[in-house]
């Protein structure tokens, strides 16, 4: 009998007749940048402080009639979803509201910037516990709004935003496109993407995860005891802001990178029907629906990784695409993907003192994506070892030769346009797990890392007959850090990680003969950290 | 209209005490860029966020804003500084004619300028 959205985000062990997970986010302050709110609504009375900040444009239209309950509608509902006593996610969280949207739900980039600056100044004047900022709004792509979000995030603030309700690529909107912000799309009770009239939730690589966002019951500004159902990516973002408040209350020292990784890790996987998304966006859109962790403590032992897709390189011959990890994350592997199959591989390279993943387009190619595997690996020391093209029949190989370094990922990059179309494939010799092997005309890059207690192993799955997709997954307790294809023959479109599964995609089988060249092997590198596990046990 | 005239009078008085000799000197190095919303109906021309380079201090932001006002006034344009940013990004929010963008992009410390645009509840 609890609202569907609260049930959906609640792990089974909490699912009694009531929604009462432990610790309701009481150590966290959530800032809401939205419309005005009805602060004396019984859902939020006493837990939402209305700041004196207001920066809104005039309402459009000469005959616009300002009605308080309408002005407060959006903000009141969201405050209720985040921290409402009876229909909220983080029932213990305290909130502060800033008015940046007018009675028609419209604001400006400049007003939002001034609001974010107000939060930063408040944080400096009176430092409190962890801060979450909810931005349930969207405008067109804005360099300055994204930059302000980046600065605030780097000051230790967790920003959560709506992906947008435009049934479009979230990367075309701000603050949804800001990499430092946690961007949330909306799903319904059937775990399907939300349709809103002719539009619906945004999607794409700029979305971090989805959350309930259709028919969400929450505080209505119509009366102090009223509830109403609202839909949108704002409601979805409010759920994630509430979940973030709960997680930060349980573990106040969590960094933004750690929080994002946990949100991804504890999400429900592969429940969204991807057919709703445009075909070219399906591979880029995370199939994740947010949920509370089953236990608020003890997640620290896991090695958390996520997949970050680059923007599309564009079709020019020398075009490249770059995928980057967050400042606190380690790039443990790099792969590439091209729908046309015409690519020249990928490589890990240093940029501004940090490793990035760069993919290379090939002549006649429609463009490539770089795919970074970004992980939380404390005290890690990672480097890239490169072997130039070998020209030997056995192919190119490179291994981690430094003492204590383990292989976390393999990349290969080639200059020739059609690698492997007329060359026999190479196979990696057995019993040599710490090395990368590739085509003799490719340079091979091994990601080698040293971190306390880090151990990795290679897992392969080969299919002799051609198939559009070959997968290999890491078993329970192990985390996928590297994903690549063997051999690097021309019909392989690329490789990428989806959660803990390595996916190697090939051209449509009808275009590929079932010769030995049709054989495709997916190679996963699976790692775990004994050090993190021990540290966690000692804490408990 | 009366309000604008009042602002203009204040501005002229401020200019008399402004050290204006350096106003024309463009900063050497990379050229600042201009950005605007790709979705035309969401654009708000006439209001601009002038973003200054990362290490710019508040005093320099204020000086740059005053310099823009001084140069604009000499060309017969009224400008209004709506807000000076500091704490997150250095810069200022200015209400001005789009005709002044070229001038503003040449000001010292300017990294880029973005035309204001609308955001919407989702």
């Amino acid at each position: 009998s609890i609202p569907w959205n609260l049930e959906r985000i609640t792990p089974p062990r909490y699912r009694a007749d009531e929604y009462q997970p432990p610790d309701g986010g009481s150590l966290v302050e959530v800032y809401l940048l939205d419309t005005s709110i009805q602060s004396d609504h019984r859902e939020i009375e006493g837990r939402v402080m209305v700041t004196d900040f207001e920066n809104v444009p005039e309402e459009d239209g000469t005959r616009f009639h300002r009605q308080a309950s309408k002005c407060d509608s959006h903000g009141t509902h969201l405050a209720g979803v985040v921290s409402g006593r009876d229909a909220g996610v983080a029932k213990g969280a305290s909130m502060r509201s800033l008015r940046v949207l007018n009675c028609q739900g419209k604001g400006t980039v400049s007003g939002t910037l001034i609001g974010l600056e107000f939060i930063r100044k408040s944080q400096l004047v009176q430092p409190v516990g962890p801060l979450v900022v909810l931005l349930p709004l969207a405008g067109g792509y804005s360099r300055v709004l994204n930059a302000a979000c980046q600065r605030l995030a780097r000051a230790g603030v967790v920003l959560v935003t709506a992906a947008g309700n435009f049934r479009d690529d979230a990367c075309l909107y701000s603050p949804a496109s800001a990499p430092e912000v946690i961007t949330v799309g909306a799903t319904n009770a059937q775990d399907q993407p939300v349709t809103l009239g002719t539009l619906g939730t945004n999607f794409g690589r700029c979305v971090d995860l989805f959350a309930p966002g259709e028919d969400i019951i929450g505080a209505s500004s119509d009366c102090s005891t009223c509830f109403v159902s609202q839909s949108g990516t704002s409601q979805a973002a409010a759920h994630v802001a509430g979940i973030a408040a709960m997680m930060l209350s349980a573990e106040p020292e969590l960094t933004l990178a750690e929080l994002r990784q946990r949100l991804i890790h504890f999400s429900a996987k592969d429940v969204i029907n991807e057919a709703w998304f445009p075909e070219d966006q399906r591979v880029l859109t995370p199939n994740l629906v947010a949920a509370l962790p089953p236990s608020t403590h003890g997640a620290g032992w896991q090695l958390f990784c996520r997949t970050v897709w680059s923007a599309h390189s564009g079709p020019t011959r020398m075009a490249t695409a770059v995928a980057r990890c967050a400042p606190d994350e380690e790039l443990l592997s790099c792969s590439s993907f091209s729908r046309s199959g015409k690519r020249r591989g990928e490589r890990m390279e240093a940029q501004g003192g940090k490793l990035v993943c760069r993919a290379h387009n090939a002549f006649g190619g429609e463009g490539v994506y770089a795919i970074a595997r970004c992980c939380l690996l404390p005290q890690a020391n990672c480097s890239v070892h490169t072997a130039p093209p070998a020209e030997a029949s056995m192919g190119t190989r490179v291994h981690c030769h430094q003492q204590g370094h383990v292989l976390t990922g393999c990349s290969s990059h080639w200059e020739v346009e059609d690698l492997g179309t007329h060359k026999p494939p190479v196979l990696r010799p057995r019993g040599q797990p710490n090395q990368c092997v590739g085509h003799r005309e490719a340079s091979i890059h091994a990601s080698c890392c040293h971190a306390p207690g880090l151990e990795c192993k290679v897992k392969e799955h080969g299919i002799p007959a051609p198939q559009e997709q070959v997968t290999v997954a890491c078993e329970e307790g192990w985390t996928l850090t590297g994903c690549s294809a063997l051999p690097g023959t021309s019909h392989v479109l690329g490789a990428y990680a989806v959660d803990n599964t390595c996916v190697v995609r090939s051209r449509d089988v009808s275009t590929t003969g079932s010769t030995s060249e049709g054989a495709v092997t997916a190679v996963a590198i699976c790692c775990r950290s004994r050090h993190l596990a021990q540290a966690s046990q000692e804490l408990q | 209209q009366e309000d604008e005239d009042g602002d203009y009078e204040e501005l002229v008085l401020a200019l008399r005490s402004e050290e204006d000799g350096l106003a024309e000197a463009p900063e050497h190095g990379t050229t600042a860029t201009f950005h605007r919303c790709a979705k035309d109906p969401w654009r708000l021309p006439g209001t601009y966020v002038v973003v200054l380079k990362e290490e710019t201090h508040l005093s320099q932001s204020e000086r740059t804003a005053r310099r823009l006002q001084a140069q604009a006034a000499r060309r017969g344009y009224l400008t209004k500084i709506l807000h000076v940013f500091h704490g997150l990004l250095p810069g200022f929010l200015v209400k001005m004619s789009g005709d002044l963008l070229e001038l503003a992009l040449k000001l010292p410390h300017v990294d880029y300028i973005e035309e204001d645009s609308s955001v919407f509840a989702q």
């Epitope: 929604y19 006593r85 009876d86 119509d222 009366c223 102090s224 005891t225 509830f227 159902s229 | -």
Partner: antibody, heavy 126, light 106 residues
Framework: QLQLQESGPGLVKPSETLSLTCTVS??????????WGWIRQPPGKGLEWIGS???????YYNPSLKSRVTISVDTSKNQFSLKLSSVTAADTAVYYC??????????????????WGQGTLVTVSS | EIVLTQSPATLSLSPGERATLSCRAS??????LAWYQQKPGQAPRLLIY???NRATGIPARFSGSGSGTDFTLTISSLEPEDFAVYYC????????FGGGTKVEIK
């Protein structure tokens, strides 16, 4: 069908704490569809809402009585209780308990007080 | 707080007559108003909610109207069991009740 029954002492001394319990039968107090409220009526006068509680323990009080009121719930006994401290003769009234539709589950029906208990008279006197 | 003023305080009518009771709010309560009937020695009973909706089991002779600040409860033809005290209640801003209108036999 759902029934509510108030119980507690009919006489309380001034400055003491008034304590009443409402027992719910014919339905579960642990439903997210309802709040459970207390309303009082001084002899010959009108009705005054005291406060309400949700199964989770969330409470809402009349601002004029907030400093003196505590409402609690015991889901295992299907009961909710009222405590009113530092009573005076002005607190003499018939005290009613009632169910209120929560609105959290929209299908639950109107968000008003229905049904009510039959009421219990509490006299504050030394 | 929102104050509800009921008028008249007492209404003396005969069975079969039409009764019109008024409730005025000190500020708009939209349509968030209910009417209750209370007979001597009994608890109040919900008659009308959200200004015009009849509660379950309430006869059709009871009807409510109004929105904003002015509301009316109408009993089209009084039955002997309808003689009682009637209260209005708002929930626009928490809960307050009116002072009541006593409908007595003339």
């Amino acid at each position: 069908q759902l029934q509510l029954q108030e119980s507690g002492p009919g006489l309380v001394k001034p400055s003491e704490t008034l304590s009443l319990t409402c027992t719910v039968s014919g339905g579960s107090i642990s439903s997210s569809s309802y709040y459970w409220g207390w309303i009082r009526q001084p002899p010959g006068k009108g009705l005054e809402w005291i406060g309400s509680i949700y199964y989770s323990g969330s409470t809402y009080y009349n601002p004029s009585l907030k400093s003196r009121v505590t409402i609690s719930v015991d889901t295992s006994k299907n009961q909710f209780s009222l405590k009113l401290s530092s009573v005076t003769a002005a607190d003499t009234a018939v005290y009613y308990c009632a169910r209120e539709g929560s609105g959290v589950v929209p299908a639950a029906g109107p968000n008003w007080f229905d049904p009510w208990g039959q009421g219990t008279l509490v006299t504050v006197s030394s | 707080e929102i104050v509800l003023t009921q008028s008249p305080a007492t209404l003396s009518l005969s069975p079969g007559e039409r009764a019109t009771l008024s409730c005025r709010a000190s500020q708009s309560v939209s349509s968030y108003l209910a009417w209750y009937q209370q007979k001597p020695g009994q608890a109040p009973r919900l008659l009308i909610y959200d200004a015009s909706n009849r509660a379950t089991g309430i006869p059709a002779r009871f009807s409510g109207s109004g929105s904003g600040t002015d509301f009316t409860l109408t009993i089209s033809s009084l039955e002997p069991e309808d003689f009682a005290v009637y209260y209005c209640q708002q929930r626009r801003n928490w809960f307050t009740f009116g002072g009541g209108t006593k409908v007595e036999i003339k």
